[in-house]
């Protein structure tokens, strides 16, 4: 860990102050204790070394203490998400102290200058925490720093500089530019708190990644792969306002991390679960829906403390708005091909029927390609709780929906003009629920008819709990 700053003078030297205030040196970080859920209330400003405001404003020394740390600002005002988060924290933790770290003067700068100010802001928070620790009953264990964007790295510095170890840091889409690939002492990292959990919602492998792509916590959660967030596309943004801009899309995706966290506070009964996976592609294939050995966790405030020796990347799908929870299912489909199918890619859809509800028609996303005479794994998710699954309808879409598919079909036909029938055989579908971890096997409703071709459908009924079937034998594959 780096050594904290030396004399006060050095602290001031590091400040990138706007020209307007260079003449008047003032503490550039304020701590506003939000004493009411009412966002209009001015709250109380805490002052280092002054105990009176703590008493006057009812600071609870034994309760949890949240520090909310904003990021870079173009407007110089608090953004609207802040009040949502304050209110959600008050709702969930009635007795908690909620402190807003106001570093607006230092954040309302060129991005590079604001980045250079993160260290001094982190140091100010650490000094405040060191002072609070001198009070009876105040414990760093009860401190939870919540930093959004650039504020996540400020939280990292604070955790690094404080005497002792803070209980938890939550990074809400930590900023990427100037932090991606940086040394652990110059960004948020797992050694900054007893538990560091991170939500990544705006990561891009091409172009500018507003949020950091690399894992920086004990658990790093990538909702929807950490890139394109539902409800934030240009069309969605256009739909909600008179004009939509790329800026609005960026803001929507970056800020989604905050709303996911707020959701975890206010919709405690609808927790979203994330699943450990090595990468987004494997998750999209449905391979990673295990909860064994701490491989799944709640996201946001409800996350269970996990201190792995190495970073744990976790993934989930979400809805476009609150409550964000969806229900994940892994589907294993063994595809037998009795005819040489060539290169054709089927477009499959499933409809799930449950005791509580039926799903919409859901596409089976083919991440790479359908393997013939092999088990293919898919991820599907529903917005509603279907209850116990009873049956599944599998449809092979008939008419081509894209020029690309049409071209593939034509090419397949040209290479094999004497193969008029395109047919696959599917006897069983194995399903695992991510949320309940329950495994079920569904068998073809008509065991004599297990073939499916474009424009046709197959029905499967639950035939057993679990996945193992008695007397399972592989059918012989007849080639034409």
């Amino acid at each position: 860990s780096p050594t904290p700053f030396g004399p006060e003078g050095q602290l001031e030297d590091e400040l990138h102050k706007p020209k307007a205030i260079q003449t008047e040196v003032k503490p550039s970080v304020r701590f506003n204790l939000r004493t009411s859920k009412d966002p209009e209330h001015e709250g109380c400003y805490l002052s280092l070394g002054h105990s009176q405001p703590l008493e006057d404003c009812g600071f609870n020394m034994t309760a949890k203490t949240f520090f909310i740390i904003h990021g870079w600002t173009m407007s110089g005002i608090f953004e609207n998400w802040l009040h949502k988060l304050v209110s959600a924290l008050h709702t969930r933790e009635k007795d908690a102290n909620v402190v807003v770290v106001d570093w607006l003067p230092l954040a309302h700068q060129l991005y590079t200058d604001a980045v250079n100010n993160t260290r001094v802001v982190g140091h100010s928070i650490a000094r405040m925490l060191d002072w609070l620790q001198e009070k009876d009953d105040f414990s760093l264990e009860n401190v939870h720093l919540i930093g959004y964007s650039l504020g996540a790295h400020v939280a990292g510095y604070a955790g690094n500089f404080v005497k002792g170890t803070v209980g938890r840091i939550t990074g809400l889409d930590p900023a990427g530019p100037m932090f991606e690939g940086a040394d652990i002492h110059k960004r948020l990292s797992p050694d900054d708190a007893d538990f560091v959990d991170v939500l990544h919602t705006y990561t891009r492998s091409f172009g500018l990644s507003i949020g950091i792509q690399m894992p920086v916590g004990h658990i790093d959660i990538y909702p929807n792969g950490g890139d394109f967030q539902p409800g934030c596309g240009l069309n969605d943004v256009l739909g909600s306002m008179a004009y939509g801009t790329i800026t609005e899309v960026v803001k929507c995706e970056h800020e989604r991390a905050v709303h996911l966290f707020v959701d975890s506070l206010v919709n405690q009964d609808k927790p979203s679960f994330a699943f450990q996976c090595t990468d987004s592609n494997r998750f999209k294939k449905g391979i990673c829906l295990s909860c064994r050995k701490n491989r799944c966790n709640s996201i946001g405030y409800n996350a269970k403390k996990m201190r792995n020796k190495r970073n744990s990347k976790m993934y989930l799908k979400t809805r476009a708005g609150m409550p964000f929870r969806v229900y994940h299912y892994q589907m294993k489909i063994h595809v037998f091909s009795y005819k040489n199918m060539g290169e054709i890619e089927p477009t499959f859809y499933v409809t799930l029927y449950g005791t509580n509800a039926d799903s919409q028609t859901l596409p089976l996303e083919i991440v790479e390609r359908i393997e013939q005479n092999a088990t293919n794994t898919f991820l599907v998710y529903t917005e509603e709780d279907l209850g116990d699954l009873l049956k599944i309808q599998l449809t092979w879409e008939g008419a081509s929906q894209s020029w690309y598919n049409l071209w593939k079909e034509l090419r397949s036909y040209l290479s094999q003009p004497h193969n008029p029938g395109r047919e696959l055989n599917i006897r069983r579908i194995r399903v695992k629920s991510g949320e309940t971890q329950r495994k079920l096997t569904f068998c073809a409703e008509d065991p004599e008819n297990t073939s499916i071709s474009p424009g046709r459908e197959l029905w499967f009924r639950k035939c057993r709990d679990g996945w193992r079937m008695k007397n399972e034998t592989s059918p012989t594959v007849e080639l034409p």
């Epitope: 307007a20 008047e24 003032k26 209009e40 005002i77 609207n80 807003v100 607006l104 306002m241 008179a242």
Partner: antibody
Framework: QIHLVQSGPELKKPGETVKISCKAS????????MNWVKQAPGKGLKWMGW????????TYAGDFKGRFAFSLETSASTAYLQINNLKNEDTATYFC?????????????WGTGTTVTVSS | DIVLTQSPASLAVSLGQRATISCKAS??????????MHWYQQKPGQPPKLLIY???NLASGIPARFSGGGSGTDFTLNIHPVEEEDVATYYC?????????FGGGTKLEIK
């Protein structure tokens, strides 16, 4: 009781400078931002910008960059608006108005208004 | 910048009747369930006074005959029953993003 009391009316010639004051009382001055709003005779309200009363950082709206300057005297709980190189179109009533740093940032308390007349 | 269009520009209402003023925003001024739309009253020779904040909340000291409603891009201010002292110009304002902008104003007169 919360009050924002502004300085009296001003009659100026084009090219001159005017400095209007807005003295706050009844609340902690640095806990709310101070806005400036222009109202030309018979016209509507136009936001000129605001100053962060804690840090002293001013923000100017697009039409008010250049000749306009916001400043503070924190010890006296007073905000100032200075207009340099006055033009005829600066003839208007100028209001200061406070807004919270938190919440929905409406202007809950307004100054008494200062009428500036620019005439040769 | 967000443009606010108020209608009508002027309004004459009989005492005791209802006055309704509309304000249309060029884009949504909602954030989640909050509306960042506010209403002010300005009497001749006086500064504006906050009437309604966040679309429907009555500011302190304002009589209950004033009410506000709406969400997204369409908002209304209602005064019922109208009294003599309500003669003034009414402005809507959005603060969801800087710069805060005002509507053009609606002048209320008594018939």
């Amino acid at each position: 009781q919360i009050h924002l009391v502004q300085s009296g009316p001003e009659l100026k010639k084009p090219g001159e400078t005017v400095k209007i004051s807005c003295k706050a009382s009844g609340y902690t001055f640095t806990n709310y931002g101070m806005n400036w709003v222009k109202q030309a005779p018979g016209k509507g309200l136009k936001w000129m910008g605001w100053i962060n009363t804690y840090s002293g950082v001013p923000t100017y709206a697009g039409d008010f960059k250049g000749r306009f300057a916001f400043s503070l005297e924190t010890s006296a709980s007073t905000a100032y608006l200075q207009i340099n190189n006055l033009k005829n179109e600066d003839t208007a009533t100028y209001f200061c108005a406070r807004r919270g740093y938190y919440g929905r940032r409406y202007f809950d308390v307004w100054g008494t208004g200062t009428t500036v007349t620019v005439s040769s | 910048d967000i443009v606010l269009t108020q209608s009508p520009a002027s309004l004459a209402v009989s005492l005791g009747q209802r006055a309704t003023i509309s304000c249309k925003a060029s884009q949504s001024v909602d954030y989640d369930v909050d509306s960042y739309m506010h209403w002010y009253q300005q009497k001749p020779g006086q500064p504006p006074k906050l009437l309604i904040y966040a679309a429907s909340n009555l500011a302190s000291g304002i009589p209950a005959r004033f009410s506000g409603g709406g969400s997204g891009t369409d908002f209304t201010l209602n005064i019922h029953p109208v009294e003599e002292e309500d003669v003034a110009t009414y402005y809507c304002q959005q603060t969801i993003e800087d710069p805060p902008t005002f509507g053009g104003g609606t002048k209320l007169e008594i018939k």
